[in-house]
């Protein structure tokens, strides 16, 4: 028998520095977790102790903190090189700055193979990107060889900016011939490493003949066997065992997100490459693991540029940006409108001629807006200003919801109106009218939404049985502020870009902003 140790990360999202337990900015260092310096300590410890070790990343290193805003992926290549990753799969967020924003900082600089079997380049891009990413890579590990085959969510064109010259094929259809090829070349130990979410990971384990292990990402899935060491609630045991259609037991793993854990899986193979056993658990990278001094010193060196960036002007406002709780928790506020407009703008994707855009709606809990911005400071808006407005380090995500769920959400928005509670919704692409004289749960008297399948966008009444795409904070997608109906009833959830980054990009693009209160949210009394 031959034993392989797979160390894996996924959805790190720019968390190069250690973070608090909830993966936001580290405040009390003695209680902080993760970060590449701490990760390196643990990886090196395992590399020294065990003979056959692979360090893999399942995508979405890009996007999530000011590190990515400033360094645009150069930081990913630099620190992943320093940690000596063995391979990485492309995630959807690796395309956030377009194909050029992937090629130049990461694909050309990475000293490890970057993989995806289901992304095919066409047109002029085909020769430009040739060889910069691969469908698979065969790695020598100890006295054996291991094949690693990559995959990426086929929803990427709706979630990011890969452009028109990359085709995202069905994962299973694309993976099977690559695995078959490796088998014919006597590679009998094959890991599928990719970024399509836990449901697809399980399908790959079930359907792709010859895949021995699946290491996934995208859904931020936390798996654990035994008592979990922190706040994350396991979605299943680690590894999650799937019985394949040809009767094999295939371990599937994922390691939550944000570099908080290092996935640790030990696989035992027989001489024919069959998995005999698999066991392990994610390792919580808490403060009991010291940060590696040389990596930490490098982080501190790179950090200097970030501090300078946060005080630079992004753009100007010529109006007061009302982010006060007195406004945003009670009525339409122009800060809410600005943020929602930025959220929609960030998700402009012309992927179908029938649609002017794939999504037109935004909802945002008023309690998530934490500060106004005064225009009387020469109108200047900085990253620092935006960090005061959106201090929680969240993301603006894409969900699919039925109309009936949206109606419930808007009822929840005003179910205890008047108490300055955070659930009051700010909106974009939505016109809502409330009648507060009615009883809670029956206060939404009009709810019109902006069409997407139209050449001239207009507002139509919400249809209860129709499925709508909505951009919202991850806080709401996870049921925060009492929006349990969103969490329970959402049909799809894809994590998006860092909240501050979305707004800062929009302001930089617009240069001068003047958001108004324009009747998106109205109140009426009596008959309608």
């Amino acid at each position: 028998a031959w034993e392989l140790t797979i160390l894996h990360t996924n959805d790190v999202h720019s968390r190069l520095e250690q973070t608090s337990e909830d993966s936001s900015k580290c405040v009390n260092a003695s209680r902080c977790m993760g970060g590449v310096a701490r990760l390196f300590t643990k990886v090196q410890q395992i590399r020294r102790a065990e003979p056959n070790v692979l360090l893999l990343d399942a995508g979405d290193q890009y996007q999530g903190t000011i590190w990515f805003t400033v360094y645009k992926g150069a930081e990913v290549a630099h620190f992943m090189n320093a940690l000596r990753y063995d391979a990485m799969a492309l995630g959807n967020h690796e395309f956030d700055n377009g194909v050029e924003g992937l090629i130049e900082p990461l694909l050309k600089e990475a000293k490890f193979p970057i993989l995806s079997a289901n992304i095919k380049a066409k047109g002029p891009l085909a020769s430009q990107i040739s060889g910069l990413y691969l469908p698979y890579k065969v790695l020598p590990v100890g006295d054996e060889v291991v094949g690693i085959v990559g995959y990426t969510s086929k929803e990427t064109p709706f979630l990011s900016n890969p452009g028109t010259n990359l085709v995202f094929e069905d994962e299973i259809t694309a993976l099977q011939p690559e695995v078959d090829k490796l088998k014919t070349l006597n590679v009998n130990k094959i890991i599928a490493l990719g970024h399509s979410g836990f449901e697809m990971d399980k399908l790959i384990a079930q359907k792709v003949r010859g895949v021995d292990v699946v290491v996934g990402g995208h859904s931020n899935t936390f798996l654990y066997t035994g008592n979990p060491p922190s706040k994350e609630v396991p979605a299943g045991k680690y590894p999650f065992i799937v019985t394949s259609d040809d009767g094999r037991k295939v371990p599937v793993v994922q390691a939550y997100a944000f570099g908080k854990y290092l996935g640790y899986l030990k696989i035992e193979f027989d001489e024919r490459g069959n998995v005999i056993s698999s066991h392990g658990n994610p390792i919580l990278l808490n403060s009991s693991i010291p940060e590696d001094p040389s990596i930490k010193a490098d982080i501190n060196k790179w950090r200097i540029k970030l501090d300078n960036y946060s005080t630079q002007e992004l753009g100007k406002t010529i109006v007061y940006l009302d982010g006060s709780s007195q406004s945003c928790r009670f009525r339409e506020c122009n800060m809410g409108n600005l943020i929602c407009d930025a959220m929609i703008n960030n998700n402009l994707r012309h992927t179908d001629e029938m649609f002017w855009n794939h999504v037109s709606m935004c909802i945002l809990n008023g309690g998530g807006i934490r500060s106004p911005i005064d225009e009387r400071n020469n109108g200047t808006i900085t990253w620092e200003n935006l960090a005061a407005v959106l201090p929680f380090g969240g993301t603006f995500d894409l969900v699919q919801l039925k109309g009936s769920t949206l109606k419930k959400a808007f009822e929840h928005s005003v179910h205890r109106y008047g108490q300055s509670t955070g659930e009051f919704l700010q909106v974009g692409g939505i016109h809502v009218v409330y009648d507060l004289s009615r009883k809670p749960g029956d206060r939404v008297v009009k709810l019109d939404v902006l069409c997407t399948k139209c050449r001239v966008p207009s507002y139509d009444p919400l249809k209860m049985d129709e499925v709508y795409k909505v951009i919202l904070p991850n806080f709401l997608a996870n049921g925060g502020d009492g929006f349990q109906m969103i969490k329970d009833e959402l049909l799809r959830h894809d994590s998006g870009d860092q909240d501050i980054n979305v707004v800062s990009t929009y302001i930089s693009k617009m240069k001068v902003i003047y958001p108004a209160v324009e009747g998106r949210i109205k109140f009426s009394t009596g008959s309608h």
């Epitope: 056959n52 490890f112 040739s130 060889g131 698979y136 020598p140 060889v145 090829k181």
Partner: antibody, heavy 118, light 107 residues
Framework: QVQLLQSAAEVRKPGASVKVSCKAS????????MDWVRQAPGQGLEWMGD????????IYNQKFKGRVTMTTDTSRRTAYMELRSLRSDDTAVYYC???????????WGQGTTVTVSS | DIQMTQSPSFLSASVGDRVTITCKAS??????LSWYQQKPGKAPKLLIY???RLIDGVPSRFSGSGSGTEFTLTISSLQPEDFATYYC?????????FGGGTKLEIK
């Protein structure tokens, strides 16, 4: 700068063994695999195998399996290739070559001539 | 094993010429191809890896292209120091295999 310094030329009789050494400098020895390649007189290049200095893991060309052993001594930053049961057609220049992150051979030793003759 | 077929085996050219050497793999090698230059009595020198990535310090007149099974090494304007033997090698799978070589001679 990266340098690979190989041992001097050797002459062996058929059936004997030879052990060629390759001393590395200018980089972290355990960060890269070492390959061995040979070239018979007037012929092309032939890959023999690969060793990971970190853990001693080896992958050999089946053609040489059972006759070749590759080892490393990390304290001496040296790789070794031993070939046993030598035949006259093993007469060749033997090269060690460091592999880069992509496993292409980016730095080569100067070569060690091994002559097998009765 | 994957067979690598290089052509031509011999090539006569003059200084300033543009020359192309081709390398065919018996099956798709996933862009895992390198090109080496070897001068008489010397060790091979890596010029290009991953089919088209030029090694630092190698003159830009050298370029690599191709994918799948067909690859080319192009020297845009031959210099006197370029007369040598060139080898392609696949490192997609084990065992690594080399092409038979192309000897580039002065016309």
């Amino acid at each position: 700068q990266v340098q690979l310094l190989q041992s001097a030329a050797e002459v062996r009789k058929p059936g004997a063994s030879v052990k060629v050494s390759c001393k590395a400098s200018g980089y972290t020895f355990t960060d890269s695999n070492m390959d061995w390649v040979r070239q018979a007189p007037g012929q092309g290049l032939e890959w023999m195998g690969d060793i990971n200095p970190n853990n001693g893991g080896t992958i050999y060309n089946q053609k040489f399996k059972g006759r070749v052993t590759m080892t490393t001594d990390t304290s001496r930053r040296t790789a070794y290739m031993e070939l046993r049961s030598l035949r006259s057609d093993d007469t060749a220049v033997y090269y060690c070559a460091r592999t880069n992150w992509d496993y292409a051979m980016d730095y080569w030793g100067q070569g060690t001539t091994v002559t097998v003759s009765s | 094993d994957i067979q690598m077929t290089q052509s031509p085996s011999f090539l006569s050219a003059s200084v300033g010429d543009r020359v192309t050497i081709t390398c065919k793999a018996s099956q798709d090698i996933n862009s895992q191809l390198s090109w080496y230059q070897q001068k008489p009595g010397k060790a091979p020198k890596l010029l290009i890896y991953r089919a088209n990535r030029l090694i630092d310090g190698v003159p830009s007149r050298f370029s690599g292209s191709g994918s799948g099974t067909e690859f080319t090494l192009t020297i845009s304007s031959l210099q006197p120091e370029d007369f040598a033997t060139y080898y392609c090698q696949q490192y997609d799978v084990f065992p690594r295999t080399f092409g038979g070589g192309t000897k580039l001679e002065i016309k």
